[in-house]
């Protein structure tokens, strides 16, 4: 009896794992083995596919074959018993195009209100992704174990921290990788769960902002308690996206080590131009807080995008705000020759309810105010250039009282 060729051959490639699966054409024939050949583009001869010769099952692994993953290959399969079937040719394919990204490895660390996620590719030193290793981005799904309500976080790098969580609570998450340059989305990792710790005695510093004064950067933050010391550390932002980097090491800013105020000043030109991350930690001598949320700090933008200055003309039911160029030391205005958009935040002095106005003009009306009421206003500038997409810090708040009724004209 003539052996029939196997049919429906599927090639599955996950990272550097090359798996072939196929269907037997004739289940009634026993003790059949299967063998594959492969052919590279531009070659006439067929070569025996190592790892896929005389296979008794309907699956084989040819991961040991050192292929150029960007080069097209063709496969063929036949059944063998006493005689052999005809060859069945599989459509040619390029391994890289066919490959899927496997589940990443995930390692979690818990804080009281945050989880640190360390992500690395599932296959170390992968041949498939050798040219793309630094281009991986990750996305994750996280949920409270007790509720199951999922939150998705996109476009994160190999080290990510999720903030604003609840203490002593179990969170679960799963992560998948993507290569946006090649339109590839990976498969999810197994679910990892971790319980956040008991709430720390000292909260982390909050609302970190960087501004420029003279030739210095001024770093300010808020803190709940007095009589504390603080330290500030920096990290090159690129190291965040560099998987398994042994150079991922936060460094101190000398002027910001053990400072007793909620600000520190350091010179602009100690940093080479670029993008950094900054974080602050508080200590009372016995205990230390967890690190603050990391802020991104871009020397190029920080150096020129200063908060706007403004004057307020108070009426009974509105403020007229006139925005001017920010001032440097010596009261000289800074010329900012790129289009800006202004974000104005205002609130009643006795309330925390903030309202926001976004305006391109430099004269802005804040309407619907109550007479004889103190309102506070702060403003910041944003670049309108999509590539820059940067913001200044907020100006200091200015508080004014509205006039008595009937003075709106």
């Amino acid at each position: 009896k003539n052996l029939k060729s196997p049919q429906k051959v599927e090639v599955d490639i996950i990272d550097d794992n090359f798996i072939l699966r196929w269907n037997r054409s004739d289940e009634s024939v026993g003790n059949v083995t299967f063998s594959f050949d492969y052919q590279k583009t531009g070659m006439d001869n067929w070569i025996k596919l190592s790892g896929c010769q005389n296979i008794t099952s309907t699956k084989c692994n040819f991961s040991s074959l050192k292929l150029n993953v960007y080069e097209e290959i063709k496969l063929r399969i036949r059944a063998e018993k006493e005689n052999t079937s005809s060859w069945y040719e599989v459509d040619s394919f390029t391994p890289f195009r066919k490959a899927q990204i496997g589940p990443p490895e995930v390692h979690l660390e818990a804080e009281d209100k945050a989880i640190v996620i360390h992500i690395s590719p599932g296959t170390k030193d992968s041949v498939m992704w050798a040219l793309d290793g630094l281009s991986f981005t990750y996305s994750l799904v996280i949920w409270k174990n007790s509720s199951g309500v999922e939150e998705r976080i996109e476009n994160i790098y190999s080290r990510h921290k999720i903030y604003k969580l609840s203490p002593e609570t179990t969170y679960c998450l799963k992560v998948k990788a993507a290569l946006l340059t090649s339109w590839k989305i990976g498969v999810y990792s197994p679910v990892h769960c971790i319980k956040t710790t008991v709430e720390n005695e000292l909260p982390p510093p909050e609302n970190i902002e960087v501004s420029v004064q003279n030739q210095n950067y001024v770093l300010k933050w808020d803190y709940t308690y007095a009589n504390m010391t603080f330290q500030v550390q920096w990290l090159h932002a690129f190291l965040k996206r560099n998987p398994g980097n042994h150079l991922y090491k936060w460094k101190q800013i000398p002027d910001c080590e053990n400072v007793k105020t909620t600000q520190c000043v350091f010179p602009q030109n100690v940093f080479q131009k670029g993008i950094y991350l900054l974080r602050v930690q508080a200590s009372d001598g016995n205990n230390t807080s967890f690190w603050s949320e990391e802020i991104k700090f871009d020397t190029e933008i920080q150096a020129f995008l200063l908060p706007p200055v403004f004057n307020i003309r108070s009426l009974s039911d509105s403020f007229h705000i006139y925005i001017g160029a920010p001032k440097q030391s010596g009261n000289t205005p800074v010329i900012q020759d790129y289009p800006l958009i202004y974000e104005i935040i205002f609130w009643e002095n006795t309330s925390n309810a903030e309202r926001k106005i976004i305006e391109k003009k430099t004269d802005v009306t804040v309407p619907n105010l109550k007479p004889l009421t103190v309102y506070c206003v702060k403003a910041r500038a944003h670049t309108m250039d999509e590539k820059l997409n940067k913001s200044s810090v907020f100006s200091d708040a200015v508080c004014e009282k509205t006039k008595p009724g009937n003075t709106s004209k």
Epitope: L134, W234, H236, F238, L239, N242, L247, K251, Q252, P254, D255, E257, F266, P267, N269, V270, F271, Q272, K273, G274, Y276
Partner: antibody, heavy 117, light 107 residues
Framework: EVQLQESGPGLAKPSQTLSLTCSVT????????WNWIRKFPGNKLEYMGY???????DYNPSLKSRFSITRDTSKNQFYLQLNSVTTEDTATYYC???????????WGQGTTLTVSS | DIQMTQSPASLSASVGETVSITCRAS??????LAWYHQKQGKSPQLLVY???TLADGVPSRFSGSGSGTQYSLKINSLQPEDFGSYYC?????????FGSGTKLEIK
């Protein structure tokens, strides 16, 4: 591990233009900052400038700008081009990496340039 | 530019001894100081940055100290591999500048 290796012509005549190469292995030059520093025969070290991960350059403002720094990311190399060299450019040239502040954590072995007529 | 004055220019010491090298800046550099060690025919190696932080892999017999304009590098219990030249470098402002070096020789 990060490794840097300089190469250059070794000998040059005054007024020539030449290029020194720094080849980086174990790390991508599309991260961090890549600097040139030279050491004169009397052992004085002088910082020259850098090219950053994004391709921005910055030079020592105290030096006459007869040089430029460029890179080729496909080769993971960066270069120091010296224009109209004089005998005062005779030195050992080092390439070095920095993370952001101007201190240098990885250095190449150095390449010696002698300018002589 | 800030000038860095290093002293002594050279010193001799024996294995096991303790030595100190000092560096004076022409202005306050607020601890933005690094120290390097260079052996003959080799490249400089970072020892200390931020005036007192040891770089990765540097033995604990090295220590940096100082503030303002005055800084020093101390080497306890000298080892044979410690001989060579030492340089300080500030990075408080651009351009960063180096000290003139201290040559440490075996007595």
């Amino acid at each position: 591990e990060v490794q840097l290796q300089e190469s250059g012509p070794g000998l040059a005549k005054p007024s020539q233009t030449l290029s020194l190469t720094c080849s980086v292995t174990g790390y991508s030059i599309t991260s961090d900052y890549w600097n040139w520093i030279r050491k004169f025969p009397g052992n004085k070290l002088e910082y020259m400038g850098y090219i950053s991960y994004s391709g921005n350059t910055d030079y020592n403002p105290s030096l006459k700008s007869r040089f430029s720094i460029t890179r080729d990311t496909s080769k993971n190399q960066f270069y120091l081009q010296l224009n109209s060299v004089t005998t005062e450019d005779t030195a050992t040239y080092y390439c070095a990496r920095s993370e952001g502040m101007y201190f240098f954590d990885y250095w190449g072995q150095g390449t010696t340039l002698t300018v002589s007529s | 530019d800030i000038q860095m004055t290093q002293s002594p220019a050279s010193l001799s010491a024996s294995v096991g001894e303790t030595v100190s090298i000092t560096c004076r800046a022409s202005g306050n550099i607020h601890n933005y100081l690094a120290w390097y060690h260079q052996k003959q025919g080799k490249s400089p190696q970072l020892l200390v940055y931020n005036a007192k932080t040891l770089a990765d892999g540097v033995p604990s017999r090295f220590s940096g100290s100082g503030s303002g304009t005055q800084y020093s590098l101390k080497i306890n219990s000298l080892q044979p591999e410690d001989f060579g030249s030492y340089y300080c470098q500030h990075f408080w402002s651009t351009p960063p500048t180096f000290g003139s070096g201290t040559k440490l020789e075996i007595k």
